[in-house]
Amino acid sequence: KIDACKRGDVTVKPSHVILLGSTVNITCSLKPRQGCFHYSRRNKLILYKFDRRINFHHGHSLNSQVTGLPLGTTLFVCKLACINSDEIQICGAEIFVGVAPEQPQNLSCIQKGEQGTVACTWERGRDTHLYTEYTLQLSGPKNLTWQKQCKDIYCDYLDFGINLTPESPESNFTAKVTAVNSLGSSSSLPSTFTFLDIVRPLPPWDIRIKFQKASVSRCTLYWRDEGLVLLNRLRYRPSNSRLWNMVNVTKAKGRHDLLDLKPFTEYEFQISSKLHLYKGSWSDWSESLRAQTPEEEPTGMLDVWYMKRHIDYSRQQISLFWKNLSVSEARGKILHYQVTLQELTGGKAMTQNITGHTSWTTVIPRTGNWAVAVSAANSKGSSLPTRINIMNLCEAGLLAPRQVSANSEGMDNILVTWQPPRKDPSAVQEYVVEWRELHPGGDTQVPLNWLRSRPYNVSALISENIKSYICYEIRVYALSGDQGGCSSILGNSKHKAPLSGPHINAITEEKGSILISWNSIPVQEQMGCLLHYRIYWKERDSNSQPQLCEIPYRVSQNSHPINSLQPRVTYVLWMTALTAAGESSHGNEREFCLQGKAN
């Protein structure tokens, strides 16, 4: 009932609680002398469903048959309307539409840990939309019975608060849950179990790991468990992996040796427990233990490459480069690299430890046969040395790869292709493709990149350290024993017209012709590999088309003669540069008048 209902009543038949799909009769009746003044035909009773009018009747009572009410609660309010006055609330009623409870399904009970209490869960089935009471009953040996009630609107869990003990682990217990509301009741099927069936051990705790003699091959995992635990399962994985390794162990008594861990790797370990081989359930996984395995000496060998540079008639500069070992090969933190340089005939050797770099440069005599060995060292030892005989990598012309080309291949990739050398191609033991950013000054500090390719390959995709709009000097070496041949080409992954033209810095006269000198375009404005320079000239104040001279681009060239200018005529000159994508804007303009005699 809503409000005090002093002026009248609202009655609901058959009940305020009805089954979905049922019809209800709602009657609103005025109490004596509570209608409008004068006579009862003036009474207009109005029925509201929530805040909207749905029916009316003139007189002392209103009768409304209502069907099709939705699940849940619907509020009906009756009001009286008299002529020339506001509506007056008479009374109201809530009608609760729902369904009888379905049979609870999948009743299951567990006790968390040997000291825990028995708690059961079940599936309620579809929502009744009504107040529904659940009663959980547990019966055990010697006619012992426990009962617990739950009055939550969404009840699907109850804890008995009792502890089953392992004194008689095979004794049977039976649980049943009953749901009751105004429209009916229903009971689950009984669930029968023993102590061993329902006790779920607590997850193992106090997990530790020990490496005997700091070795990854002698590793033991330790943990603590509840007293009755018979089985454990262990799972472990490298911290950066999603896949677990799984091990099942019986009667482990809180320890297990692990034999397949990788060195210098952070692992995550978890353990779960069970009381019986085929009864009961596994505990939750323990909290994770994270631990790093010890280092082992590196495996594998460094990939080493080198560059030779002529200094003078007696000396040469050797620059060695090597790539880091992979994590699985390094098997620890690389502390230093050991480089040994040896003259093979005289047996002189020098050894140096390099830290923080993967390159080393030294100057050696141009005479003698030289070899280097490079190895990587961690706290446990060194990798096998990589040995290289220093030779003239481009000396054997017949070993030079032919028809080398470099083409853009998608974003920041260059596809390098070649043909085998003329000399017996089967003599090639491997190809090395080397690339570095092109710097006009031939800067030796520019990082060097390389990759090795099998002798039957005639192409390589280079993608490491490749940037758009940068020109790379690419060399392909064919190596055979202690001989090498090479070919080079310029290439870029992406290009556009240069952003500026060359800056003419001087024009000088030499025997009736002129020599133009210019500054190179800054690398960041070249926008790829330059193909040509163009020198333009025309008579000052003339509207005629300029003449031009196109010069193939060479890295070191920065001057060019022109001999087609007329004496005592003032010319305006400027330059542009071209990539495969197009021509730059003008560089600066310079005026020049050739002083030579007229013919």
Partner: nanobody
Framework: QVQLVESGGGLVQPGGSLRLSCAAS????????MSWVRQAPGKGLEWVSA????????SYADSVKGQFTISRDNAKNTLYLQMNSLKPEDTAVYYC????????????????WGQGTQVTVSS
């Protein structure tokens, strides 16, 4: 979904009669009081008549009292309006709707409305 379909309108001479029908579907017709509302050209909505859910009580606007009769057949889910002695001022579009009250301003909800039927009274 709710559907109210009016019919029976047309052109009639002054003094003539028409009977409007409204076929209801998509809701429980017998739960609700129903109304006729009309809208004359260039004017606002005007409540005309109402009938309660079981047909035992009716109300009329003063302008049509004694001239129009509202009725319903819950078995056929149909509402009727019998219009006699029609006058030119009865020219309007007539709408069948769920009852919201007996004043023009009560009809702000448009969820239980038909598309209307045109009644034109002219000689």
């Amino acid at each position: 979904q709710v559907q109210l379909v009016e019919s029976g309108g047309g052109l009639v001479q002054p003094g003539g009669s028409l009977r409007l029908s409204c076929a209801a579907s998509g809701f429980t017709f017998s739960n609700y009081a129903m109304s006729w509302v009309r809208q004359a050209p260039g004017k606002g909505l005007e409540w005309v008549s109402a009938i309660n859910s079981d047909g035992t009580s009716t109300s009329y606007a003063d302008s049509v009292k004694g001239q129009f009769t509202i009725s319903r057949d819950n078995a056929k889910n149909t509402l009727y309006l019998q219009m006699n002695s029609l006058k030119p001022e009865d020219t309007a579009v007539y709408y069948c709707t769920k009852w919201e009250g007996d004043t023009d301003s009560d009809y702000k909800f448009k969820d239980y409305w038909g598309q209307g039927t045109q009644v034109t009274v002219s000689s």
